[in-house]
Interface confidence: low
């Protein structure tokens, strides 16, 4: 991009941070007007996120990025998500010491929660590499949500669409088995932790995307905010992911893609995360940021204060 | 899902000794595999981990040196145990930690002569 | 090695009482604290992981608090069922490489 468009481009989005009230969290709407003008999202973003249309089944208006950085990491609209917007420094300050207060919230919604089991049973299905019946998925959800089965098969594809890049196939238009296409081009992501098996390495990315939209340091209420709507639990061993706090706190902090942190001076002690060393060589804000817009069906514009200081990160490193 | 250890029994003193782990209805690939094991009236000493991620073991410092643990598939952990004394007699347990824990019931090994 | 040290070694109370068991650790441990419940001739049950969120199917009679050196078990409304030797156990931090997966010595609750 020329140097004059850049500044241009970088005093627009100063002026929309201006308005932006709570930092990351509560994303403006870009409006169809605003988004004529914004050349970042037609030319400037390599890896085609800006041509992506939005994912089926998710109801976004045009360019909104959901409210809280779980459900922009996660791919839900904003409607789904379960906080609102909060104060960034508010949030962080009323963290609790553990990540219980947030897991396993009993007021959620059965539904999410029947679409989180789904999801993990269709990614265990997937791991095993077998084709999976209607049947089976109805067993999964029950006599009790049956009728609501339509709904919950609807959240759970789009679960594993957008943060796996799985779809799921019906084998012919009446039958009832259905078998996975595996849509997203691996490439951008061989690097990150290519020694994993699929589906663990592909909550890398999202979870990234949660610490930086939470302004580079997230808490275990964040992450568990995220991985609650995945239907990963805390406490509650999963099918694919195995025990997710060892994952999260253990595997991905030893690789050294994550840090995890006892925020200084805080008692009792609360435990933040952070970006590891290997995230910042294998990856960048910008890719994570991209990634971060193809699953919500939207640009890196619609957040426009991470674009900002991607961008910045990317003329740091001299990209 | 369960956990079931094997390989106890007698042994004589400064004998050797191979316990084995073996998972039911999963794989032990996400896990910390441990060996714990408690004297007959006594309380709960570990002994020692792997994690089956990455392949890393530790160890208690007594451990060290007489206790090796070895994942052997994607189901089984054994634990090589040599120079045993009769104060190594116990029911050895496997656990799948940390915060989703398993045990299997246990092995009973005696070290007499 | 981390030390845990458990007191009492034993405890008595009625039926309906509260217990209290206290956990402290050589070395600030943070919340990276498990209770465990063993009866006669089975393995340890998992009561309280992580110093305070109980276990799946665990009542919240049980409560679990502390951090750093410092942790707590109380049982409350004390059943019958609760007779038991119960145990905390350290496992290590992840900030470091230092693995400590230990055990306090236990306490014997009987409930009369």
């Known amino acids: 991009m020329p140097r004059g468009q850049k500044s241009k481009l970088r005093a627009r989005e100063k002026r929309r941070k201006a308005r932006d009230e709570t930092r990351g969290l509560n994303v403006p709407q870009v409006t169809e007007a605003e988004e004529e003008e914004a050349p970042c999202c037609s030319s400037s973003v390599s890896g085609g996120a800006a041509s992506s249309s939005p994912a089926a089944g998710i109801p976004q208006e045009p360019q909104r990025a959901p409210t809280t950085a779980a459900a922009a990491a996660a791919g839900v609209s904003s409607t789904k998500s379960k906080k609102g917007a909060k104060s960034h420094q508010g949030e962080k300050n009323a963290s609790s010491s553990q990540a219980s207060t947030s897991t396993k919230s009993p007021s959620e919604d059965p539904l999410t929660r029947k679409s989180g089991s789904l999801v993990q049973f269709l990614l265990y299905k997937y791991k095993i590499k077998k084709s999976v019946t209607k049947g089976e998925m109805l067993k999964i959800v029950g006599k009790r949500f049956r009728e609501h089965f339509p709904e919950i098969l609807k959240k759970a594809s789009e679960g594993l669409s957008v943060v796996f890049g799985l779809e799921l196939n019906k084998v012919n238009p009446n039958g009832h088995t259905y078998t996975f296409i595996d849509k997203v081009d691996l490439t951008d992501e061989e690097s990150l932790l290519s020694s994993w098996d699929f589906p663990r390495r592909k909550l890398l990315m999202p979870l990234l995307g949660v610490i930086f939209l939470n302004g580079n340091s997230a808490t275990e209420e964040e992450i568990w905010e995220f991985l609650n709507m995945l239907g990963v639990y805390d406490g509650e061993e999963h099918s694919v992911f195995g025990e997710p706090w060892k994952l999260i706190t253990k595997d991905l902090v030893q690789e050294k893609y994550l840090e995890y942190k006892q925020v200084p001076s805080s008692d009792p002690p609360r435990f933040q995360f952070l970006w590891g060393p290997r995230a910042y060589a294998e990856t960048s804000k910008m890719k994570v940021l991209e990634f971060l817009a193809k699953v919500n069906g939207t640009t890196p514009c619609a957040f426009p204060t991470h674009y900002e200081e991607a961008l910045k990160d990317e003329e740091k490193a001299g990209v | 899902q369960s956990l079931e250890e094997s390989g106890g029994g007698l042994v004589q003193p400064e004998g050797s000794l191979t316990l084995t782990c073996t998972a039911s209805?999963?794989?032990?690939?996400?896990?910390?595999i441990c060996w714990v094991r408690q004297a007959p009236g006594k309380g709960l000493e570990w002994i020692a981990c792997?994690?089956?991620?990455?392949?890393?073991t530790y160890y208690a410092s007594w451990a060290k040196g007489r206790f090796t643990i070895s994942r052997t598939s994607s189901t089984t952990v054994t634990l090589q145990m040599t120079s045993l004394t009769a104060a190594d007699t116990a029911t050895y347990f496997c656990a799948r930690s940390l915060s989703t824990p398993l045990w299997g019931p246990g092995t009973l090994v005696t070290v007499s002569s | 090695d981390i030390v845990m040290t458990q007191t009492p070694f034993s405890v008595e109370a009625a039926v309906g009482g509260t217990v209290t068991i206290k956990c402290q650790a050589s070395?600030?441990?943070?919340?990276?604290l498990s209770w465990y419940q063993q009866k006669p001739g089975q393995p340890p049950k998992l009561l309280i992981y992580?110093?305070?969120p109980l276990a799946s199917g665990v009542p919240s009679r049980f409560k679990g608090s502390g951090s750093g050196t410092q942790f707590t078990l109380t049982i409350s409304d004390l059943e019958c069922a609760d007779a038991a030797t119960y145990y905390c156990q350290s496992y290590d931090d992840s900030s470091s490489n230092n693995f400590f997966y230990g055990f306090g010595g236990g306490t014997e609750v009987v409930v009369r």
């Open positions: 992580r110093a305070s």
């Open positions: 792997i994690d089956n991620v990455n392949g890393r």
């Open positions: 070395q600030s441990i943070s919340s990276y």
């Open positions: 209805g999963f794989t032990l690939n996400n896990y910390y």
